[in-house]
């Protein structure tokens, strides 16, 4: 902590300008009024203060606002934001999307830091839900943001926000997250026609149930293998060979290359070999002819 010393004659800062980069730390502490700093925060980012000088400026703001900075100051923190701890940020009440954008810009190009994660958490909690504009902003800065949320947090995403989601935003989502997002996407895109609907829903299909996959198979969608491989195994298993053939269209030939991988491997084990042979792909491992298939899960449900 900088010790209190009197400001040398003639060095009292009348405004926040570049002359301050030549002030020693103790001179900044003694000669810069915290209230002046707060009102001229927009200038700080344009001035190449040293990292140690930024520590002094932060200290002055902390003394002026022990309960947390007002949004008028937060919006103009610029590089000073990088000096903030998650504990500092938890004291803030950030309501403006412009403030959020300004601070995310400072951290642009870097991994999401604990400070940014705390800031986003404060912002979203303050809003009550992840609205479209917020989601737009967050995924623009952090494409993986959506997949960093828990299924419980994702449940607060309104279906209207799903329009902001791009395919790459879902790259790292696991099945539990897609289970939450898929019904929202289905609702959001429900008024689109067949081919347009499929383009939009495709990225979310890792959360689709069997009945929806069956419905898609009737619409000539030509699902690619990459999408098929991301489907829930339990949703794929009940599909018939004919349904999978219709679902994949010309891409059905790709099953051969994936026959040892889930969900294709498990699906093959559930199909009659006769039916698999109709595909002409040489898929092996189906149920031999003459065998009776007992659906034990159905039996358990009845007993």
């Amino acid at each position: 902590e900088v010790e209190k010393t009197a400001c040398p004659s003639g060095k009292k800062a009348r405004e926040i300008d570049e002359s301050l980069i030549f002030y020693k730390k103790w001179e900044l502490e003694a000669c810069v009024d915290a209230a002046l700093l707060a009102t001229q925060m927009d200038r700080v980012n344009a001035i190449p203060f040293t990292y140690e000088q930024l520590d002094v400026l932060k200290h002055k703001l902390d003394e002026l606002y022990p309960q947390g900075y007002p949004e008028s100051v937060i919006q103009h923190l610029g590089y000073l934001f990088l000096k903030m701890s998650p504990e500092d940020i938890r004291k803030w009440n950030v309501t403006s999307l412009e403030t959020l954008k300004a601070l995310l810009e400072v951290n642009k190009g870097h991994e999401m830091s604990p400070q940014v994660a705390t800031l986003i958490d404060r912002f979203v909690k303050g809003r009550g839900q992840l609205d479209k504009d917020t989601l737009d902003t967050l995924t623009a800065f952090y494409p993986g943001y959506l997949c960093s949320l828990s299924p419980e947090e994702l449940s607060s995403v309104p279906p209207s926000s799903i329009w902001a989601v791009r395919p790459q935003d879902l790259d790292t989502c696991d099945p539990r997250q897609l289970d939450v997002l898929y019904p929202k996407a289905r609702l959001a895109f429900q008024n689109m026609n067949g081919s347009e609907y499929f383009v939009k829903i495709q990225s979310f299909l890792g959360g689709a149930p069997t009945e929806d996959l069956k419905a898609l198979s009737q619409q000539n969608v030509s699902m690619d293998l990459a999408t098929f491989m991301k489907l829930r195994t339990d949703a794929v298993l009940p599909l018939t060979v004919a349904e999978v053939q219709k679902l994949l269209g010309p891409h059905v030939e790709g099953l051969k290359a994936e026959e040892r991988h889930r969900p294709v491997r498990d699906w093959i084990l559930r199909q009659r070999q006769d039916d698999l042979d109709t595909l002409g792909l040489g898929l092996q491992g189906g149920i031999p002819n003459g065998y009776l298939v007992l659906d034990l899960s159905m039996q358990e449900a009845l007993s």
């Epitope: 570049e18 030549f22 040293t50 990292y51």
Partner: nanobody, 124 residues
Amino acid sequence: EVQLVESGGGLVQPGGSLRLSCAASGLIFSTNAMGWFRQAPGKGRELVAAISWRGGYTYYPDSVEGRFTISRDNAKRMVYLQMNSLRAEDTAVYYCAAGTARIDYLSQDGYNYWGQGTQVTVSS
């Protein structure tokens, strides 16, 4: 990278004047501050003047305040040091330096690009 070349040094009598020039090239727009340092035989480098590259704000230590003036011409990418009322103790090699890192601009730590230096000798 920033390249710096000093000129204008020489022999001058006590009480006389000299004007040093520093030509900067390369990524000069990334510079935060420019400084003139000097190093007398057997001594460490000391800052004698600094100027903020964008705003043109200046700094001088007490030893040269009122005698030395630093200035810059951004368009020409030049930094100057006007030295008046020179004394024997001003004899040293004078270096031009550019600081692009956000580190102490009042010490040599804050300057990561340096010229080769120009000799200034004050003697009768």
